[in-house]
């Protein structure tokens, strides 16, 4: 039975131009993570894996930077980068946790962060 | 250039243990992810598993029961041992380099292989 | 496990047509995907990876395409050199799993 819940930055927002940490927690399980994967729709942004560590997909080289810790920082943000990020952890024996942040880019300076929330698990996959 | 050289017996018996062996020259083993991965005749390729750079392995839940891989960093080569081997474990068995920083789980190097054949 | 199936088992292209492989994978794997070519006696060799990234030195004949479920590698131009059989094989998610090959002859 999967115990664990995700919790996320939640709804966040940035400054065109500047940067964002992504970042997710995954808690209240004792599954090992082998490796937790960041996307956004159908792209892969990167592959953090526990023995051989990180793998940022070769279309966000550029401006993707990976950590802290299992989470992702967007650099150079662009309008275009609005929208739902996904962090997905694969672990053992559980399965696979989905966190869901939405990030809304903003041209002026009025960004501030969303409040932190938990979202329990609602992906599951073996 | 990184260059592998599988060496080992062509044929082992029925329930015996397999045993392989992989020369990495041209790189250190101590560096990205060193991989096993077989072709059974007419069969697709199957990944079986890795010691990492750090010495970590991961291997493949259809054969984690039977399955070891380790290293020797001073002689610069890592090996398979497969055991309780029955006639479905013959196959053509490559050794591997895995660059996980660049290319993800894609093998970028690969030896030549050797044929295994288990039979009494 | 994810489940990499491809089609045509094979492929009888004239020199100098397109030749297109398809891979489907049983769940989406977005880009993890990678294709190799393995010439007959020889060991596969990389040609595609992230769904479509020529690895150093592979021809601009070759290209990868596709995202989720659905992948393609495709020949522009056959040469009498591509004659091979070509492998996807998904990075999403371990165990890394092959398809079972597509083998591609000269018409």
């Known amino acids: 039975m999967m115990t664990g819940t995700i919790e996320t930055t939640g709804n966040i927002s940035a400054e065109k131009g500047g940067s964002i940490i992504l970042q997710c927690h995954l808690s209240s399980t004792t599954a090992q993570v082998t490796q937790v994967n960041w996307e956004q729709q159908d792209q892969l942004l990167a592959i953090c894996n526990a023995d051989l560590g990180w793998h940022i997909s070769p279309s966000f080289k550029d401006r993707v930077a990976p950590g802290p810790g299992l989470g992702l920082t967007l650099q150079s943000l662009t309008v275009n980068d609005t929208g739902e990020y996904f962090c997905i952890y694969h672990t053992y024996p559980d399965g696979t946790y989905t966190g869901r942040i939405f990030l809304e880019v903003l041209e002026s300076s009025v960004a501030e962060h969303g409040a932190r929330f938990q979202i329990p698990h609602h992906h599951h996959h073996h | 250039e990184v260059q592998l050289q599988e060496s080992g017996p062509g044929l082992v018996k029925p329930s015996e243990t397999l045993s392989l062996t992989c020369a990495v020259s041209?790189?250190?083993?101590?560096?990205?992810?060193w991989n096993w991965i077989r072709q059974p005749p007419g069969k697709k390729l199957e990944w079986m598993g890795y010691i990492s750079y750090s010495g970590n392995t991961y291997y493949n839940p259809s054969l984690k029961s039977r399955i070891t891989i380790s290293r020797d960093t001073s002689k610069n080569q890592f090996s398979l041992k497969l055991s309780s081997v029955t006639a479905a474990d013959t196959a053509v068995y490559y050794c591997?380099?895995?660059?996980?920083?660049?290319?993800?789980?894609?093998?970028?190097?690969w030896g030549q292989g050797t044929t295994v054949t288990v039979s009494s | 496990d994810i489940v990499m199936t491809q089609s045509p088992d094979s492929l009888a292209v004239s020199l100098g047509e397109r030749a297109t492989i398809n891979c489907k994978a049983s769940?989406?794997?977005?880009?993890?995907v990678a294709w190799y070519q393995q010439k007959p006696g020889q060991s596969p060799k990389l040609m595609i990876y992230s769904a479509s990234y020529r690895y150093t030195g592979v021809p601009d004949r070759f290209s990868g395409s596709g995202s989720g479920t659905d992948f393609t590698l495709t020949i522009s131009s056959l040469q009498a050199e591509d004659v091979a059989v070509y492998y996807c094989?998904?990075?999403?998610?371990?165990?890394?799993?092959f398809g079972g090959g597509t083998k591609v002859e000269i018409k």
């Open positions: 769940q989406n794997v977005r880009t993890a």
């Open positions: 094989q998904q990075y999403y998610t371990t165990p890394w799993t």
């Open positions: 041209g790189y250190s083993i101590t560096s990205d992810s």
């Open positions: 591997a380099r895995l660059d996980f920083s660049n290319y993800g789980g894609a093998v970028d190097y």
